[in-house]
């Protein structure tokens, strides 16, 4: 759930998830339209297909919560649980990653950017 | 050889609580991804998972029912322990301990322990 | 949570025959889990992971089946299949039964 990945996304890039990513660019944050930004923003958009097609599996994204163990910079998903929480911290974990190694290019100037700006071809999933 | 034997008290008032005890050979409940599970089943019904708690003592309870149950182990006795508070008719039941490995199934089971709750 | 309905709940059928049980889940799941219980013994492992047969389980048997329709197919029904047998699900917490069908033999 959303308490998991606000947790996992501080533990792997250091960062306040509300401050810092939550609403970031046109995808980071509830909701998405438009073309990613940049790389930070493309983390997100790819993190909202992983959540579209586990709620097409019927998991309920947003209140499943999981076991996960963080430890030396890692994230390890627990293999207990159902298999939507599994999956869902596999997609959490993904992001994570991929926002930290994306930090050298974050931009300030993105965070709680304007959606209405948000234009051009959403990416399909 | 992996084994499961359940017991409890047979008969029970209602409103009294239940305690059963799961005691198990085969497998050790300290070795990662092993989880036991407890499992009823009302004469002539079907099955209803109640509990389980794994090798870390995590444990998961069925929303349903949660407020009522505490699971337990004691991995040096390799036994599993369930209690159930305020029991009434609809407990009646065959009460199951099975083992679920790394997968979602429930691959071994004990013969199961009945219970009866008399009003 | 997500229900699971058996169809049907009671089922005869002549040696030989070829017997299908229905498992039908409220939402997509991933995979279906299937046991078999006779009278006065526990549920037995009987199909995982929708299709592979548990240890010890005839090849007449055989389970299929994606998103919110599963089956357990026998390809020609024997005596000792008589029994009740129940699906299960574990995509989502917490983990569920269906309500068991029950096959006699005729």
């Known amino acids: 759930g959303i308490l998991n990945l606000n947790k996992m996304v501080k533990q792997v890039t250091g960062k306040m998830p509300i401050l810092s990513y939550w609403p970031y660019g046109c995808h980071c944050g509830l909701g998405g339209r438009g073309q990613p930004k940049d790389a930070t923003d493309w983390c997100c958009q790819t993190h909202d297909c992983c959540y579209d097609h586990l709620k097409t599996q019927g998991c309920s994204i947003y209140k499943d919560y999981y076991r996960y163990n963080f430890s030396q910079g890692n994230i390890h998903c627990s293999d207990k649980g159902s298999w939507c929480e599994q999956q869902l911290c596999a997609c959490d974990k993904e992001v994570a990653f991929c926002l930290k190694r994306n930090l050298d290019t974050y931009q300030k100037r993105l965070r709680f950017y304007w959606r209405p700006h948000c234009r051009g071809q959403t990416p399909g999933c | 050889q992996v084994t499961l034997k359940e017991s409890g008290p047979g008969i029970l008032q209602s409103s009294q609580t239940l305690s059963l005890t799961c005691s198990f050979s085969?497998?050790?409940?300290?070795?990662?991804?092993?989880?036991v599970s407890w499992i009823r089943q009302p004469s002539g019904k079907g099955l209803e998972w109640l509990a389980h708690i794994y090798w870390d003592d995590d444990k998961r309870y069925n929303p349903s029912l949660k407020s009522r149950l505490t699971i337990s182990k004691d991995t040096s006795r390799n036994q599993v322990f369930l209690k159930i508070t305020g029991v009434d008719t609809a407990d009646t039941a065959t009460y199951y301990c099975?083992?679920?490995?790394?997968?979602?199934?429930?691959?071994?089971w004990g013969h199961g322990t009945t219970l009866t709750v008399s009003s | 949570q997500i229900v699971l309905t058996q169809s049907p709940a009671i089922m005869s059928a002549s040696p030989g025959e070829k017997v299908t049980i229905s498992c039908s889940a409220s939402s997509s799941v991933s995979y279906m889990y299937w046991y078999q219980q006779k009278p006065g013994s526990s549920p037995k492992p009987w199909i995982y992971r929708t299709s592979n047969l548990a240890s010890g389980v005839p090849a007449r048997f055989s389970g299929s089946g994606s998103g919110t329709s599963y089956s357990l197919t026998i390809g020609s029904m024997e005596a000792e299949d008589a029994a009740t047998y129940y699906c299960?699900?574990?995509?989502?917490?917490?983990?569920?039964f269906g309500g068991g069908t029950r096959l006699e033999i005729k």
């Open positions: 299960q699900q574990y995509h989502s917490y917490p983990p569920t």
């Open positions: 085969g497998f050790s409940l300290s070795t990662s991804g092993m989880c």
């Open positions: 099975a083992l679920k490995g790394r997968d979602y199934g429930f691959d071994y």
